[in-house]
C-alpha cells in the first residue's frame, strides 16, 4: 500500500499509447462468458487516480479556452488594423471613417448574402429530412440478422463479376500447393475414416466380435 | 536632417506606367504619413496621395484613384507612387513630402526635390 | 471639392515692406490652412500651419492669421530671401486642395 502512495507522490508519468487490439480479441468478451477480474488498485488509489485525470483535464480545458482566446485575438489583429494616425489631420480622419464606412457596409452586405444562402440550405434540409422521414414510414425496415460470411463470399457479393476473376486468379496460384498436400489430405482422410468406423455402432460390434 | 530624394521620372507614351521612389533619412519614417504632390507645368500644385505610418490607409483623389497607388516600405524607409495608365495630364514634377499633423490640422511639413514626369506621345 | 482662391496670382514689393497675401477657401475649412513658399530653384518649404502656427526653422517676420473662409499672410518685412511664390492649402477635407499660387516680385 505504501507503494500506492508513493506513486502519488511522484510526477504523473505520462500514460503510453494504448495497444490497438484486433477486434477478435473482443468479439471472445462478448461471447463466451468469463469470471470478473479482481482490481488490483486499491480505492484510494482509484481516488487519487481519478482526482489526477480530472486535474489534467481541466488544465487541458484551461489550455484549449486560452487557445481559442488566442485564435480570437489572432483573427481579429489580420483584420483589424491598428489605426494609424500618425501625421493624419482631419480630413484624412474624416475620409478614413468614410473608408471604414464603406467597408463595414460591404462586409454586412455579405453577411446578408451569407446569412440568405444559409436559411436556403437549412429549409432545404429540413425538407430533405422531412422527405427521409416519409420514406422511412412506407417502408418496413427487415430485422437483420448477423450473417458469418467467408471472404471470398464477401468479395463476391461485393465485386460481382471482378471477384469471380480475381477468385480465379487465387484459385491458379494456390495450385502448385495443392499438389503436394492432396497426398497428406487422402492420409489424413483414411485415418479419419478409421476413426469413424470404430467410434459408431459398426465400431462395438467388430470390436465385439473380434 | 530631414531629406527625402525622388527618382524613378522619365518621358513615356499615355498609357504607360512608372514607378517612382522616394528615399527619407534623418528622421523615425514608420512614424509618419506620407505624401506625393505634384506641380503642373502651369505651376499648380495637386495633392496626389497620402499613406498612413504603416501602409494600412491610403488616401486618394478622384483624379488619380484606380491609376495610381501609394505604398511604403518602412523596412527600407523609402515611399512608392506606382503610376498607371498614365495621361498626359499626369505630366508634372512629382514631389515626395513627409506628413505632421497638428490638433487635427495636417500638413507637409518636409518635402523632396521633386522628380520630373512627361507623358507624351 | 473645396477651391482655393488667391486674390491675385503675382504681387510686387520692395525691400523691408510689409506684405500681405490674402487665400479665400469655397467653404469653411475650420482653421485648417497652411501655407508653403516655393524658391525659383523649385525648393518647396512649410511657413506656417493651422493658420497661425509657425513651422520651425522659419523667420518670424512670417505671420499668418484669418478664419472660417478668409485667410492671409504677412511678411512684415520683405528681404531678398523672400522672393518666392506662396501656396495656400486646405487641410479640412480630401481632396487636399492648393491656391494657384501667388509669385512675390521685387519692385
Known amino acids: 500500500m505504501a507503494d500506492g502512495s508513493s506513486d502519488a507522490a511522484r510526477e504523473p508519468r505520462p500514460a503510453p499509447a494504448p495497444i490497438r487490439r484486433r477486434s477478435s480479441n473482443y468479439r471472445a468478451y462478448a461471447t463466451e462468458p468469463h469470471a470478473k477480474k479482481k482490481s488490483k488498485i486499491s480505492a484510494s488509489r482509484k481516488l487519487q487516480l481519478k482526482t489526477l485525470l480530472l486535474q489534467i483535464a481541466k488544465q487541458e480545458l484551461e489550455r484549449e479556452a486560452e487557445e481559442r482566446r488566442g485564435e480570437k485575438g489572432r483573427a481579429l489583429s489580420t483584420r483589424c488594423q491598428p489605426l494609424e494616425l500618425a501625421g493624419l489631420g482631419f480630413a484624412e480622419l474624416q475620409d478614413l471613417c468614410r473608408q471604414l464606412h464603406a467597408r463595414v457596409d460591404k462586409v454586412d452586405e455579405e453577411r446578408y448574402d451569407i446569412e440568405a444562402k444559409v436559411t436556403k440550405n437549412i429549409t432545404e434540409i429540413a425538407d430533405l429530412t422531412q422527405k427521409i422521414f416519409d420514406l422511412r414510414g412506407k417502408f418496413k425496415r427487415p430485422t437483420l440478422r448477423r450473417v458469418r460470411i467467408s471472404a471470398d463470399a464477401m468479395m463476391q457479393a461485393l465485386l460481382g463479376a471482378r471477384a469471380k476473376e480475381s477468385l480465379d486468379l487465387r484459385a491458379h496460384l494456390k495450385q502448385v500447393k495443392k499438389e503436394d498436400t492432396e497426398k497428406e489430405n487422402r492420409e489424413v482422410g483414411d485415418w479419419r475414416k478409421n476413426i469413424d468406423a470404430l467410434s459408431g455402432m459398426e465400431g462395438r460390434k467388430k470390436k465385439f466380435e473380434s | 536632417e530631414v531629406q527625402m530624394v525622388e527618382s524613378g521620372g522619365g518621358l513615356l507614351k499615355p498609357g504607360g506606367s512608372l514607378k517612382l521612389s522616394c528615399a527619407a533619412s534623418?528622421?523615425?519614417?514608420?512614424?509618419?504619413?506620407m505624401s506625393w504632390v505634384r506641380q503642373t507645368p502651369e505651376k499648380r500644385l495637386e495633392w496626389v496621395a497620402t499613406i498612413s505610418s504603416g501602409g494600412s490607409y491610403s488616401f486618394y483623389p478622384d483624379s488619380v484613384k484606380g491609376r495610381f497607388t501609394i505604398s511604403r516600405d518602412n523596412a527600407k524607409n523609402t515611399l512608392y507612387l506606382q503610376m498607371l495608365s498614365l495621361r498626359s495630364e499626369d505630366t508634372a514634377m512629382y514631389y515626395c513630402a513627409r506628413r505632421d499633423n497638428y490638433y487635427g490640422s495636417s500638413f507637409m511639413d518636409y518635402w523632396g526635390q521633386g522628380s520630373s514626369v512627361t507623358v507624351s506621345s | 471639392d473645396i477651391q482655393m482662391t488667391q486674390t491675385s496670382s503675382s504681387l510686387s514689393a520692395s525691400l523691408g515692406d510689409r506684405v500681405t497675401i490674402s487665400c479665400r477657401a469655397s467653404q469653411d475649412i475650420t482653421n485648417y490652412l497652411n501655407w508653403y513658399q516655393q524658391k525659383p530653384d523649385g525648393t518647396i518649404k512649410l511657413l506656417i500651419y493651422y493658420t497661425s502656427r509657425l513651422h520651425s526653422g522659419v523667420s518670424s517676420r512670417f505671420s499668418g492669421s484669418g478664419s472660417g473662409t478668409d485667410y492671409s499672410l504677412t511678411i512684415s518685412n520683405l528681404e531678398q530671401e523672400d522672393i518666392a511664390t506662396y501656396f495656400c492649402q486646405q487641410g479640412n477635407t480630401i481632396p487636399l486642395t492648393f491656391d494657384t499660387g501667388t509669385k512675390l516680385e521685387l519692385k
Open positions: 534623418g528622421f523615425t519614417y514608420s512614424n509618419y504619413a
